[in-house]
């Protein structure tokens, strides 16, 4: 009897370890999306970027969905969201539209139940990129902890999209779930 | 029999609490490394920074290894990586070699199995640090979520290392494990 | 006997699932605090920002306390801390006191047991905001992984507080617990 119970206990421990590990894995959605360099719009207006990679190089996604430029939440929770956006210009690309630039990023959340869009985080800088220098570069990083519900969508808006650095290490955004909602 | 089983159940619960807590702790490597101010290289070229503290002040490491300027992964997993790099110049340090600067950071991953180095994240800015101002300062922050395998190494490269701010609150990088690989 | 044990095992699994889920939730304090725009100090000196929202819009707090401008740790652990601080100036607000600005943020930790304050992270930039441009903007982001003890307090200091952007998506700071202390 006693040995039998101990064997059951070992089974409990074993199955629990599997279950805990499995549920932990399943409970932690994440995404790291990198800019799709083949489809960067031009202009100095603010635009919602629609083309991101989710499955090549550093880009990856699990238990979240990527569709038409939006990162879709599949699981309620508190997530850490982040974005890194790099802008650059080389004189060989031709003159800048203006030397006074507003280089900005906005991380927005859209609720499809109530069609509305809200900015969660913003960052950036006004820059004077003078013709005296042949190369200009500037990066923005933002990050924060947010409650996200299943079905909500995260997207990235930037100003001056034609100046985006198309490298996967330069322009990306992502999210990972930290904890459940109580 | 029934009481005995209940006692065993209590033991299971108790041992499980310990086991879960312990395995959770062991499953979460981290590091926060701060610049070693006594060994900052000079020059304006791009260099890999090799001297970091791992056990004084805010610096700490657990279940990861620091060796020869590289943060070595001991446990497969998805990690959040970050870096904060500050540059500064005071006129009392003498004139800058040039007023047009490219202040950059690159967070790189090296795989020793396949000797290759890849940039995971980059950030920075071109700056015009004119002689009209006696003090100049600029900080870069980058962060992202990456799959790391045991044995892979993370290192930090910067341009203009002689301009680095040597404070532990200024120039640092780190990582913490968020979840296992499926 | 054997059926009874299996029933007990099922109970163990069930109660454990509840317990694990509950303890996981309780073990993860977090906060995301957004600037209180109605109470931003003026001036160009460095000040500790004391007015933050903790329960409206994106602002939230759980298992941590906010009091007198400080985020108080209630539970020992390793936390990821972050701050995003935006500065802006529009010519319609009148002339700047000086065109040469030092826009900085300092994330500080105060220990009430040993009354002392230490800077965990800093970031920022010197800026030349010339009168040639009608609008200026600049954002700082910092983040890092720190060991925090119950009773310790996190606060935010900035230079030039009168230039702070009062939007909740612009100026905020936060923390979330990643793991226990061994």
């Amino acid at each position: 009897g006693s040995q039998h119970i101990r064997a059951e206990k070992a089974m409990v421990d074993g199955s629990w370890l599997d279950l805990a590990k499995r549920s932990k894995l399943e409970a932690q959605p994440f995404a790291h999306l990198t800019i799709n360099a083949t489809d960067i719009p031009s202009g100095s207006h603010k635009v919602s970027l629609s083309s991101w990679y989710h499955d090549r190089g550093w880009a990856k996604i699990s238990n979240m969905t990527f569709s038409n430029g939006k990162l879709i939440v599949n699981q309620d929770g508190f997530y850490y969201l982040y974005a890194n956006i790099c802008f650059r210009h080389h004189e060989t690309s031709g003159d800048l539209a203006t030397e006074y630039l507003q280089l900005m990023v906005y991380v927005t959340k859209t609720s499809i139940k109530i069609p509305s869009s809200h900015t969660l985080m913003k960052g950036g800088s006004t820059k004077y990129w003078s013709g005296n220098s042949e190369f200009h570069f500037y990066s923005i990083n933002v990050g924060g902890f947010f409650k996200l519900r299943s079905g909500e969508e995260i997207s990235i808006e930037v100003s001056n999209p034609s100046l985006l650095d198309p490298d996967q290490d330069a322009t990306y955004f992502g999210a990972f779930k930290v904890r459940d909602i109580d | 029999g029934s009481q005995h089983i209940r006692a065993e159940k209590a033991m299971v619960d108790g041992s499980w609490l310990d086991l879960a807590k312990r395995s959770k702790l062991e499953a979460q490597p981290f590091a926060h490394l701060t610049i070693n101010a006594t060994d900052i290289p000079s020059g304006s070229h791009k260099v890999s920074l090799s001297s970091w503290y791992h056990d004084r002040g805010w610096a700490k490491i657990s279940n990861m290894t620091f060796s020869n300027g590289k943060l070595i992964v001991n446990q497969d997993g998805f990690y959040y990586l970050y870096a904060n790099i500050c540059f500064r110049h005071h006129e009392t340090s003498g004139d800058l070699a040039t007023e047009y600067l490219q202040l950059m950071v690159y967070v790189t991953k090296t795989s020793i199995k396949i000797p290759s180095s890849h940039t995971l994240m980059k950030g920075g800015s071109t700056k015009y640090w004119s002689g009209n101002s006696e003090f100049h300062f600029y900080s870069i922050n980058v962060g992202g979520f990456f799959k790391l395998r045991s044995g892979e190494e993370i290192s930090i490269e910067v341009s203009n290392p002689s301009l680095l701010d040597p404070d532990q609150d200024a120039t640092y990088f780190g990582a913490f494990k968020v979840r296992d690989i499926d | 006997g054997s059926q009874h044990i299996r029933a007990e095992k099922a109970m163990v699994d069930g109660s454990w699932l509840d317990l694990a889920k509950r303890s996981k939730l309780e073990a993860q304090p977090f906060a995301h605090l957004t600037i209180n725009a109605t109470d931003i100090p003026s001036g160009s000196h460095k000040v500790s920002l004391s007015s933050w929202y903790h329960d409206r819009g994106w602002a939230k707090i759980s298992n941590m306390t906010f009091s007198n401008g400080k985020l108080i740790v209630n539970q020992d652990g390793f936390y990821y801390l972050y701050a995003n601080i935006c500065f802006r100036h529009h010519e319609t607000s009148g002339d700047l006191a000086t065109e040469y600005l030092q826009l900085m943020v300092y994330v500080t930790k105060t220990s009430i047991k040993i009354p002392s304050s230490h800077t965990l992270m800093k970031g920022g930039s010197t800026k030349y905001w010339s009168g040639n441009s009608e609008f200026h903007f600049y954002s700082i982001n910092v983040g890092g992984f720190f060991k925090l003890r119950s009773g310790e307090e996190i606060s935010i200091e900035v230079s030039n507080p009168s230039l702070l952007d009062p939007d909740q998506d612009a100026t905020y700071f936060g923390a979330f617990k990643v793991r226990d202390i061994d």
Partner: antibody, heavy 117, light 108 residues
Framework: QEQLKESGGGLVTPGGTLTLTCTAS????????MSWVRQAPGRGLEWIGY?????SPYYANWAKGRFTISRTSTTVDLKMTSLTTEDTATYFC?????????????WGPGTLVTVSL | DMIQTPASVEVAVGGTVTINCQAS??????LAWYQQKPGQPPKLLIY???TLPSGVPSRFKGSGSGTQFTFTISDVECTDAATYYC????????????FGGGTEVVVK
Amino acid sequence: QEQLKESGGGLVTPGGTLTLTCTASRFSLINIGMSWVRQAPGRGLEWIGYIYSGGSPYYANWAKGRFTISRTSTTVDLKMTSLTTEDTATYFCARHASDGGWYLDIWGPGTLVTVSL
Amino acid sequence: DMIQTPASVEVAVGGTVTINCQASQSIGSNLAWYQQKPGQPPKLLIYLASTLPSGVPSRFKGSGSGTQFTFTISDVECTDAATYYCQQAYTASNVDNAFGGGTEVVVK
């Protein structure tokens, strides 16, 4: 209430030049994008181009070379050269959304430009 | 650049009308819809494909992303008689026209 008003329209002969001006009232054009759009009689809307604060403009393919957009902190101008009868239309100026998006949330009433001998 | 269909549509009061807009390339959610009544300038009804500015009735609905977009008016009222235009707000280079050709909505 925030308003825009176009001025400078009227009759012009083919080959001529005309400059239209857009003036804002009760809001500043600082840090705001502005578009020019035209509409020929009985036809649809046609985007001409836009300009942002301190910036150089972007134009529709057909407008490059003949149309020039410029701005001050209070006005936005549209200069049109080598005008033809095809340019006869009502010309609108419109403000971009204050967040920088290319969404036209305030429009002027329009000014009619007639190109005729 | 933007193809809008149909060119004209008739709808009864209380009915529903649907207008389609197709972009020549993917524009994500960067699309706006406008209403224009005779002798007036256009009025912004929807931006970012589905977001309503304040003051616009919820009877107006936008959807879609990428290259296919839909604009719907439900519970149509007499005052909805107007011409409706879509506008891409994605790229400002190599643009022939940012606007669609328009759809005239006639209310019976």
